[in-house]
């Protein structure tokens, strides 16, 4: 008697980038003989009980081709990670993994004036945000004069893998000789967010 087999073929990329709030279908085709007995989709050691479906290519008795689809809806930034499809029959087990990255608009986590006179901005998002600094003198609303940061670091996120990337940027406020506003602008492919520091008043954060 022939030994059984299972061959899995992804029908979409196994590395998936999806924007925050969007849907994505993880789809595999697989060949199985004898017939598959057990299929499951797993994320973070949790098995999906719904949101997926499995069906044969044809309903002929000789059919060995099947498809399984996992429907991920309105994905959040915290739902990136490895999604795994597992299938088994009486002879073998097989699995395939999808790495899902959720693109998120930067969020400014902290914006501080440090005791050493530095202004520090920390932003998180995916892909990794870029932080730019601008100075606007007096009461002008538009900050167009760019300021070079003294220090930029990518920090390790405490969240799950595939989560947001955290960037910290600092400038030296002693370079500013006049009252005014400093803008910290964090941006990536998804969007941008700004925070403002007014030299005359306490700091304010205004996401845009």
């Amino acid at each position: 008697v022939d030994k059984g087999f299972i061959n899995i073929f992804p029908m979409i990329n196994t590395t998936v980038f999806v924007n925050d709030g969007e849907n994505v279908d993880l789809i595999v085709e697989y060949e199985a003989f004898p017939k598959p007995e057990h299929q499951q989709w797993i994320y973070m050691n949790r098995t999906f009980t719904d949101k997926w479906e499995d069906y044969p290519k044809s309903e002929n008795e000789s059919n060995i081709r099947y498809v399984s689809e996992l429907h991920l809806t309105r994905l959040k930034g915290t739902e990136g990670g490895t999604y795994t499809f597992l299938v088994s029959n009486s002879d073998v087990n097989a699995a395939i993994a999808f790495n899902v990255y959720v693109n998120t608009k930067p969020e400014i986590l902290t914006y501080d004036r440090l005791v050493n006179g530095m202004l520090q901005c920390v932003a998180a998002g995916f892909p990794e945000p870029t932080i730019d600094w601008y100075f606007c003198p007096g009461t002008e609303q538009r900050c167009s004069a760019s300021v070079l940061p003294v220090d930029v670091q990518t920090l390790n996120s405490s969240g799950p893998p595939f989560g947001k990337l955290v960037v910290q940027s600092s400038i030296d406020s002693s370079a500013f000789k006049h009252n005014g506003t400093v803008e910290c602008k964090a941006y990536n492919d998804v969007g941008k967010t700004s925070a403002y520091f007014n030299f005359a008043f306490k700091e304010q954060i205004h996401p845009h």
Epitope: F9, M11, I12, N13, N23, V24, D25, I27, E29, D50, K51, E53, Y55, P56, K57, E59, V67, E69, H71, T73
Partner: antibody
Framework: EVQLLESGGGLVQPGGSLRLSCAAS????????MAWVRQAPGKGLEWVSV????????PYADSVKGRFTISRDNSKNTLYLQMNSLRAEDTAMYYC??????????WGQGTTVTVSS | DIQMTQSPSSLSASVGDRVAITCRAS??????LNWYQQKPGKAPKLLIY???KLEDGVPSRFSGSGTGTDFTLTIRSLQPEDFASYFC??????????FGPGTKVEIK
């Protein structure tokens, strides 16, 4: 034989509504995700919506979101497309199709929708 | 959205000719590409899925190749029943799939 048969098309005024039906036969309808795809006269194909086998997952193309509703009745082996607030640009041949992976492996013959005053 | 383009938009060929139709994606879609044939007044028919897998019942003179952004549908020896329009479709961004504009194959 695996077959899909659409019905319910016709002439409707802008702002009006139509409900398309697709009767499936020759396969276990309740096991398969289904889709609607349309084709404007002389143009290419445009995906409209998909529905999972259970009916719990129903994404839409941006062009129809909020106006069209896909549904299915597995006990009747029938797929539906409720089309509201119809516009001239919705004029097309509407095809019902069985989804296989990311494509469609079985298609109906289509039903014509004309939106005109 | 991923945009799909096809070339040529139409071509004239004779029975027995080898015909190649190309499809290009606006970004890499690996091999997540399907090809359909459509005859006038008829529904599309799936020919090739996953860039190179022949659908059941499709003659072996049809073949698909390519990966990334550039794909080709080849008809090895054109038959009278092959005069039709051909569409490519990406499934990389499922559920938001998109189709190419089509290539019409006419009799020379």
């Amino acid at each position: 034989e695996v077959q899909l048969l659409e019905s319910g098309g016709g002439l409707v005024q802008p702002g009006g509504s139509l409900r398309l039906s697709c009767a499936a036969s020759g396969f276990t309808f309740s096991s398969y995700p289904m889709a609607w795809v349309r084709q404007a006269p002389g143009k290419g194909l445009e995906w409209v919506s998909v529905i999972s086998s259970s009916g719990g997952y129903t994404p839409y193309a941006d062009s129809v979101k909020g106006r069209f509703t896909i549904s299915r009745d597995n006990s009747k082996n029938t797929l539906y497309l409720q089309m509201n607030s119809l516009r001239a640009e919705d004029t097309a041949m509407y095809y019902c199709a069985r989804r296989y992976g990311g494509g469609m492996d079985v298609w109906g013959q289509g039903t014509t929708v004309t939106v005109s005053s | 959205d991923i945009q799909m383009t096809q070339s040529p938009s139409s071509l004239s060929a004779s029975v027995g000719d080898r015909v190649a139709i190309t499809c290009r994606a606006s970004q890499s879609i690996d091999t997540y590409l399907n090809w359909y044939q459509q005859k006038p007044g008829k529904a599309p028919k799936l020919l090739i899925y996953a860039a190179s897998k022949l659908e059941d019942g499709v003659p072996s003179r049809f073949s698909g190749s390519g990966t990334g952004t550039d794909f080709t549908l080849t008809i090895r020896s054109l038959q009278p029943e092959d005069f039709a329009s051909y569409f490519c479709q990406q499934s990389y961004s499922s559920p938001g799939i998109t189709f190419g504009p089509g290539t019409k194959v006419e009799i020379k």
